[in-house]
C-alpha cells in the first residue's frame, strides 16, 4: 500500500505518487501544464519514465491481487513457477554491471518484453476494480517495445514469439483452476516488475545509446506515444 497515496486509482490515471511527476497514459495529453523550468525530455528520460509508469500500474494491480488472496505470502510459488516460462535476466544477457553489453542487453530487454505480452494478455480478464490499469500496462508495454526496437541496431537477433504457441499457452493458462490462476497472476506481476526494474538499471547504464533528445515541443508531462515513434 502506498504510504502517501490518497484516493483510489481510477481509469487510466496512474498517479505517480509525486506532485511533480503526474504521468498520463501514452497518447493522452496531460491536464497539467508543463513546468516552465523543465528541459525537454531526452529519449533516455522518456524510456525511464515509461518503464516507471508501467511499474506503477503493476503496483496497483499487485495491490488488488494481494488484497483479495494470500498469494503474495504463499510459499507454494516455486510449485506454480515451474509451469510458467517467465522471462528473467541472467548474467549472460549482458544487462548486469559485470559483463555489461549494450547490444546484447537491449536485445534481451526487447525479447523479454515481447515474451511477456502473452502473459499481459492473460491478465486482461483477471481484475475487477483495476481492469483499466491492466489495459494501461498492456498498451504502455507495446509502446515501450516499439520505442526500444527503434533504438536496437541488431533487430535480427530479436526473436518474436510464435503466435500459435502463444494462443495455446493462453488457452492453457485460462483453463487452470482458480487457485492456480490466482498464483499465475501473482507470479506474472512479480516477474514483470522484476524484469522491468532490471531493465531500468541497465538502460540507465546505457546512457549515450539512448540519450538523443527526441522532443522539441518541451512536453515534459507527456509520455511516449505512437506519434513519437
Amino acid at each position: 500500500d502506498y504510504k502517501d497515496h490518497d484516493g483510489d486509482y481510477k481509469d487510466h490515471d496512474i498517479d505517480y505518487k509525486d506532485d511533480d511527476d503526474k504521468l498520463v497514459p501514452p497518447g493522452e495529453d496531460s491536464k497539467d501544464v508543463a513546468a516552465p523550468h523543465r528541459q525537454p525530455l531526452t529519449s533516455s528520460e522518456r524510456i525511464d519514465k515509461q518503464i516507471r509508469y508501467i511499474l506503477d500500474g503493476i503496483s496497483a494491480l499487485r495491490k488488488e491481487t494481494c488484497n483479495k488472496s494470500n498469494m503474495c505470502e504463499s510459499s507454494k510459488e516455486a510449485l506454480a513457477e515451474n509451469n510458467l516460462n517467465l522471462p528473467k535476466m541472467a548474467e549472460k544477457d549482458g544487462c548486469f554491471q559485470s559483463g555489461f553489453n549494450e547490444e546484447t542487453c537491449l536485445v534481451k530487454i526487447i525479447t523479454g518484453l515481447l515474451e511477456f505480452e502473452v502473459y499481459l494478455e492473460y491478465l486482461q480478464n483477471r481484475f475487477e476494480s483495476s481492469e483499466e490499469q491492466a489495459r494501461a500496462v498492456q498498451m504502455s508495454t507495446k509502446v515501450l517495445i516499439q520505442f526500444l526496437q527503434k533504438k536496437a541496431k541488431n533487430l535480427d537477433a530479436i526473436t518474436t514469439p510464435d503466435p500459435t504457441t502463444n494462443a495455446s499457452l493462453l488457452t492453457k493458462l485460462q483453463a487452470q483452476n482458480q487457485w492456480l490462476q490466482d498464483m499465475t497472476t501473482h507470479l506474472i506481476l512479480r516477474s514483470f516488475k522484476e524484469f522491468l526494474q532490471s531493465s531500468l538499471r541497465a538502460l540507465r547504464q546505457m546512457g549515450d545509446l539512448i540519450s538523443v533528445p527526441v522532443d522539441s515541443r518541451g512536453s515534459e508531462q507527456k509520455l511516449i506515444s505512437e506519434e513519437d515513434l
Epitope: D1, Y16, D18, R52, L55, S59, F96, K193, Q197, Q205
Partner: antibody, heavy 121, light 109 residues
C-alpha cells in the same frame, strides 16, 4: 525488522576480510540490500547494492573490484578483497525498501548499527 | 550521478529554521532521499521521493525539489535535531561515484 553487521576487526593491509549482514523480521528473498561505509569523521559512502530475483549487483564507480557483495538465503556478505588503510571505516548494511512502498528508486529504510573495520600494519 | 551538499555545517537557534541544499550532477527526477545521523548512531531515513515523510518522522522536516536541485528544511528546530544530514540519489544504474551528498552538520545553539 532488524539488520545487523558482523565481522569487523583489525586487519593488516592486503588481508582479505568478509563482513556479514544478518536480518530478521523480513526475508532476504524479498528485498535488495546495500552496503555503505563511513570513514572516521567522514560522510556516508555507497559501496553497492545486491538486488533480489535477478541477483544482479551494482557497485559505485570507484569500487573497481575492491569489494564483492554476495547474497545467500540468510546473509549478505561484503568481501574487502585487498584492504588498504583507506578502507578503515564503519561498514553499514541497509535494506532497500520495496518499489510498492517507495517508487522507482532505492530508499534505504532499515539500517544496521555498523561494524568497524580497522586496517593497519 | 554525483551529489553536492551545502552548507557543510550550519548553526541554528532552538525554534529557528534551517535549510540544506543538495544538487545532483544530472537530473534524478524526484528520486532523492534524506537521512539523519547522530554521532555514534546508524543513519535514519527522514524523507523519500524528495518530499514524502518517512513513517514516524516529525512534520518539522520537509523536503522539496525536482531534477537537480533539492532542499531539506527543518522548521522549529529542537535540540534533538542536532545531527548530520545526508541526501542520497536513488537512481541505480549509470555511473554513480557516490549516491550520498557530503553531509551537513546541524549544530543547535
Amino acid at each position: 525488522q532488524s539488520v545487523e553487521e558482523s565481522g569487523g576487526r583489525l586487519v593488516t593491509p592486503g588481508t582479505p576480510l568478509t563482513l556479514t549482514c544478518t536480518v530478521s523480521g523480513f526475508s532476504l528473498s524479498s528485498y535488495a540490500m546495500t552496503w555503505v561505509r563511513q570513514a572516521p569523521g567522514k560522510g556516508l559512502e555507497w559501496i553497492g547494492t545486491s538486488y533480489v530475483y535477478s541477483g544482479d549487483t551494482w557497485y559505485a564507480s570507484w569500487v573497481k573490484g575492491r569489494f564483492t557483495i554476495s547474497k545467500t538465503s540468510t546473509t549478505v556478505d561484503l568481501k574487502i578483497t585487498s584492504p588498504t588503510t583507506e578502507d578503515t571505516a564503519t561498514y553499514f548494511c541497509a535494506r532497500v525498501g520495496d518499489y510498492d512502498d517507495y517508487g522507482a528508486h532505492d530508499v534505504f529504510d532499515s539500517w544496521g548499527p555498523g561494524t568497524l573495520v580497522t586496517v593497519s600494519s | 550521478y554525483d551529489m553536492t551538499q551545502t552548507p557543510a555545517s550550519v548553526e541554528v537557534a532552538v525554534g529557528g529554521t534551517v535549510t540544506i541544499k543538495c544538487q545532483a550532477s544530472e537530473s534524478i527526477s524526484s528520486w532523492l532521499s534524506w537521512y539523519q545521523q547522530k554521532p555514534g548512531q546508524r543513519p535514519k531515513l527522514l524523507l523519500y521521493r524528495a518530499s514524502t515523510l518517512a513513517s514516524g518522522v516529525s512534520s518539522r522536516f520537509s523536503g522539496s525539489g525536482y531534477g537537480t536541485e533539492f532542499t531539506l528544511t527543518i522548521s522549529g528546530v529542537q535540540c534533538e535535531d542536532a545531527a548530520t544530514y545526508y541526501c542520497q540519489q536513488g537512481y541505480t544504474g549509470g555511473n554513480v561515484d557516490n549516491a550520498f551528498g557530503g553531509g551537513t552538520k546541524v549544530v543547535v545553539v
